[in-house]
Amino acid sequence: MMTGTIETTGNISAEKGGSIILQCHLSSTTAQVTQVNWEQQDQLLAICNADLGWHISPSFKDRVAPGPGLGLTLQSLTVNDTGEYFCIYHTYPDGTYTGRIFLEVLESSVAEHGARFQIP
């Protein structure tokens, strides 16, 4: 039975040209995390494999940095980066947990972080 929950940074906003950290945290389970995948819609951004370390998608090397931790840093943001991002935790023996983050990239200099929320 999957007992864990993923806590994410939720709905967040950031300034065009700036950077943002996407973070997820898996709690309430003793399952072992074998890999975390980061996706934007259906595009792979990066993989953090417990044995092999980070793989950054070549398509995003110029604008994505690994970390901190299992998180992902997006740099040089553009309005086109607005949208859904997913952290996909592959665990043993539980299986797969998915967290969702919505990022809005603003032209304005006023960009505030949304509240944290949980996805069961």
Partner: antibody, heavy 117, light 113 residues
Framework: QVQLVQSGAEVKKPGASVKVSCKAS????????IHWVRQAPGQGLEWIGD????????NYNEKFRGRVTLTADTSTSTVYMELSSLTSEDTAVYYC??????????WGQGTTVTVSS | DIVMTQSPDSLAVSLGERATINCKSS????????????LAWFQQKPGQPPKLLIY???TRESGVPDRFSGSGSGTDFTLTISSLQAEDLAVYYC?????????FGAGTKLELK
Amino acid sequence: QVQLVQSGAEVKKPGASVKVSCKASGYTFTNYWIHWVRQAPGQGLEWIGDIYPGGRYSNYNEKFRGRVTLTADTSTSTVYMELSSLTSEDTAVYYCARYYESAMDFWGQGTTVTVSS
Amino acid sequence: DIVMTQSPDSLAVSLGERATINCKSSQNLLYNSNQKSYLAWFQQKPGQPPKLLIYWASTRESGVPDRFSGSGSGTDFTLTISSLQAEDLAVYYCQQYYNYPFTFGAGTKLELK
């Protein structure tokens, strides 16, 4: 030990399709990307595309997009490359290679595909 | 696409002498986050698949003799064989794996002088 074993040589007519297999062993199949590279007779190396068996991710060289399809069967640790609408310019040795982040470290023995009428 | 330009096209070297092959990339291959250049060197002998020699521009693959070394960063790279052995006669390719599509140099044929 890590091994990538490819299917045997193929002879095809122009306009036909070919499907080449690459069976992996000696490592965790779903952890690594498999890339495909081809080499025409007496020529250099040309990247075709890659696939990640641990997910639904694949990438293609625009030159081959629409003509090539990469698939993976995790139950048999095998990756397939299918190339359609073959012409004589597709005559080449086709290689699969394992990759994560540091380089293509292990290669298959190669599969010769000959396109001739 | 990133263009990889190798020089020379062919190189004749005496046994025991040094061989140097150059590779220039049309774009920067250095990833700021880990300060690694995504450049590999391969050796290919007739009828065989390419063999990985060097990755991240300067890291020698396990089992590769230490007479092979790679250097450079960003856009300019060099493969050096410090003392040529008969078994080193082959074609050498550089490859970038920084961005899609991955691309190779045209190759350098290493021959005996």
